[in-house]
């Protein structure tokens, strides 16, 4: 090899050992029979050398640094050449470094030809191994602007006072052009400006200078986004840290052409704007930090550019002004992550503040719109609390548990609507009366409706789930001792059509001691399956539940248990079941932890089934499933 550097070129070439590898044979640079491991060639020098091994790329790296001084004379602006040409250099991992020094008042602009650049974060690497590391200068301090790969959106980076650009090329890479040019600009009066150009839909992740370390104190950095007018941009902060400010406030400012409120100022913790049409600027402004405990300011954010969706021009009014203690959340439904670009899916408040989820609270009227390619990617969850604090006022009072029509008219599927029903302890209980009798969901007879009611205790310490119930069964009402949550959960978009089938009334009734009482009025046509609460986890310790089962005069009920034994093992107390005829009060008592369960029994009159648990040993829980079937009486036994 012969490397000759022109006298005034301000180029230095350094060949040195790379990261040490466990290669058996060492390798040397050979210059007139001398074996060395480092070679430095300066401007005006000409050196001939070879390598002592066949694969020097496994041992050595080469650095070519060009110092460009714009302080003392004119600056060589224009396309930057790779000097010396890559064809004259050994095939080693090579880094070309351009160090440009300029006056504070001079702006320098790096322009990147296609492909543009894509910023990468710490620990990331570029697929083709080609990286661009760019840093600036504040007085004597070097500031890392970022590390970039090819195939992105960054087209220009403007700085002042100097710039250092390092282009790293792997030994096998055929690239023979720098891919950028330098131009002079007037002072930019800030650390840097990064221009990001979108030709179509896409996303860009960008970071504050020095990321993940701290952004320089009291500095200003701007990103300019060039977005076709027919597309919409949304900003989301992926990661940020705030420093401890002594004076001024850390903030981001948006300049949105056409906005009457420019610049729009946001705190970093605010929801960032979305659904912006066309170009916009985003600036990060630091503060004067506390000298004793400065902390760090850093920001990593994503800009998502996509077509406006049909829904984005529609405004939906959600009137919660007459509601109390209610919150509605629109959020992404859980999905498997895919690796290809997926357009964002946002919900916007007043068309501007867009985010992937939004919570609306009662007491106000809200205007929302959607910026989303596919609204099935979102769902709604609503929570409403109905509480009674004064038992004298609430007793016998009823409330309808209905999904408000405003919510049903939204173009997003309702997932859960939860009512938290709270009563004064030991004073009142609750009764749920459905518009249509309910069926309890069991493996033997699953619900196949578009929605179900999930009923569970709302007492934090109590793990009691009464079950899942859907319209079209035999359960006429459910009485519960204390606080519960009733969740209407939808399972199919057809819920919108079936919404009329929903309807549950809750009333506050005098307090009773049993955990729950189910009133069952079986139909002659079908078998009713019933199971104890907390199925699969076992009825909680010392809990008592009853079923009030009606038998019409001309029918006989067959009560069947689906196991021979309950399987419960008591640590303390006894688990028992009482079957009591309501007319004669005659009762049978079964010890569930000892006796076998009764064989199928026939009941000519309405009867009670009461199950009371002991304190079971873990793993030996009380779970019972039974059925009631009506058949016509053949002989009148009255």
């Amino acid at each position: 090899f012969e490397i000759a550097l022109p006298r005034e070129s301000n180029i230095t070439v350094l060949i040195k050992l790379g990261t040490p590898t466990l290669l058996a044979k060492p390798c040397y640079i050979v210059i007139s029979k001398r074996h060395i491991t480092m070679l430095s060639i300066k401007s005006g020098e000409r050196i001939v050398f070879t390598f002592s091994c066949q694969s020097p790329e496994n041992h050595f790296v080469i650095e070519i640094q060009k110092n460009i001084d714009c302080m003392s004379g004119p600056c060589p602006f224009g396309e930057v050449q790779l000097q010396p040409s890559t064809s004259l250099l050994p095939t080693l991992n090579r880094t070309f470094i351009w160090d440009v020094k300029a006056h504070k008042s001079i702006g320098l602009e790096l322009q990147f030809s296609i492909p543009r650049l894509r910023q990468i974060g710490p620990g990331e690497s570029c697929p083709d191994g080609v990286t661009h590391s760019i840093s600036g200068r504040i007085d004597a301090t070097v500031v890392r602007i970022g590390t970039f790969c090819s195939n992105g959106t960054v087209s220009r980076i403007k700085m002042q006072e100097g710039v250092k650009m390092a282009l790293h090329l792997p030994w096998f890479h055929p690239r023979n052009v720098s891919g950028f040019s330098i131009a002079n600009r007037s002072s930019i009066k800030r650390l840097c400006i990064i221009e990001s150009v979108f030709e179509g839909e896409g996303s860009a992740t960008l970071m504050s200078a020095n990321y993940p370390e701290g952004f320089p104190e009291d500095e200003l950095m701007t990103w300019q986004f060039v977005v076709p007018a027919h597309l919409r941009a949304s900003v989301s902060f992926l990661n940020f840290n705030l420093s401890n400010c002594e004076r001024k406030e850390e903030r981001v400012e948006y300049y949105i052409p056409g906005s009457t409120t420019n610049p729009e100022v946001f705190k970093l913790e605010d929801k960032q704007p979305g659904n912006m049409a066309g170009n916009f600027n985003l600036s990060l402004q630091g503060c004067d930090q506390d000298a004793q405990s400065p902390g760090i300011l850093r920001l990593q954010f994503q800009v998502l550019v996509q077509h406006p969706q049909n829904e984005s021009n529609k405004i939906y009014v959600v009137d919660l002004s007459n509601e109390r203690a209610m919150s509605l959340t629109i959020e992404p439904r859980p999905v498997k992550q895919s690796r290809k670009f997926v357009p964002g899916c946002f919900v916007c408040l007043e068309s501007r503040t867009c985010s992937s989820n939004l919570t609306l609270t009662s007491g106000s009227k809200h205007k929302i719109s959607f910026l989303c390619d596919d609204l099935t990617r979102l769902w709604m969850n609503v929570e409403k609390t109905i509480s009674c604090t004064d038992h004298r006022y609430c007793q016998r009072k009823s409330y309808s548990l209905q999904v408000p029509s405003d919510i049903l008219h939204l173009p997003v599927e309702l997932h859960d609507f939860s009512w938290k029903l709270l009563v004064p302890k030991d004073r009142l209980s609750l009764v749920l009366v459905p518009a249509q009798k309910l069926q309890q969901h069991t493996h033997e007879k699953p619900c196949n409706t578009s929605f179900s009611y999930l009923v569970a205790s709302a007492i934090p310490s109590q793990d009691l789930y009464f079950g899942s119930f859907c319209p079209g069964g035999s359960i006429k009402q459910i009485q519960v001792k204390q606080n519960i949550s009733v969740t209407l959960r939808t399972f199919a978009p057809s819920f919108q059509q079936e919404a009329s089938r929903q309807g549950l009334t809750v009333s506050f009734i005098p307090y009773f001691k049993e955990e729950g009482v189910f009133t069952v009025t079986p139909d002659t046509k079908s078998k009713v399956y019933l199971r104890t609460p907390n199925w699969d986890r076992g009825l909680p310790s010392l809990t008592s539940v009853s079923w009030n089962i009606s038998v019409p005069r001309d029918q006989v009920a067959c009560l069947t248990f689906f196991k021979e034994r309950s399987g419960v093992v008591c640590q303390t107390g006894r688990a028992f079941m009482i079957i009591q005829e309501q007319r004669t009060r005659a009762e049978e008592i079964f010890s569930l932890d000892e006796d076998v369960l009764p064989k199928p029994s026939f009941h000519h009159h309405s009867f009670w089934v009461n199950i009371s648990n002991c304190s079971p040993t873990s793993g030996k829980q009380l779970d019972l499933l039974f059925s009631v079937t009506l058949t016509p009486r053949t002989v009148d036994l009255t």
């Epitope: 090899f1 070879t50 091994c53 066949q54 694969s55 790329e57 095939t91 030994w171 096998f172």
Partner: nanobody
């Protein structure tokens, strides 16, 4: 004098396969890194795949899973098996050998993929 001669190019329909060969002269071959590159009309020459002297390979994203590099040391030949070809694979394909820090190029072989 180190010489690399490519062969095996031609016209193939989209979805078809081709196998390119690169015969290397003498001592360059054994223990040297070898690679395949391509240049489409009006475009920069780009890496297809390179195999380092240690045997590790580096494929361009656009060919991963479709192209495979292999070599026969006894015949001083490196191969490029190209499957599921696409019209955008149309280019002149060059073989490159790395020897004592020098990168030697072959003269290239034309591959045309018709749709």
């Amino acid at each position: 004098q180190v010489q690399l001669v490519e062969s095996g190019g031609g016209l193939v329909q989209a979805g078809g396969s081709l196998r390119l060969s690169c015969a290397a002269s003498g001592s360059i071959f054994s223990g040297s890194a070898m690679g395949w590159y391509r240049q489409a009309p009006g475009k920069q020459r780009e890496l297809v795949v390179v195999e380092s002297s240690g045997g590790s390979t580096n494929y361009a994203d656009s060919v991963k899973g479709r192209f495979t590099i292999s070599r026969d040391n006894a015949k001083n030949t490196v191969y490029l098996q190209m499957n599921s070809l696409k019209p955008e694979d149309t280019a002149v394909y060059y073989c490159r050998g790395f020897y004592y820090g020098m990168g030697y190029w072959g003269k290239g072989t034309q591959v045309t993929v018709s749709s």
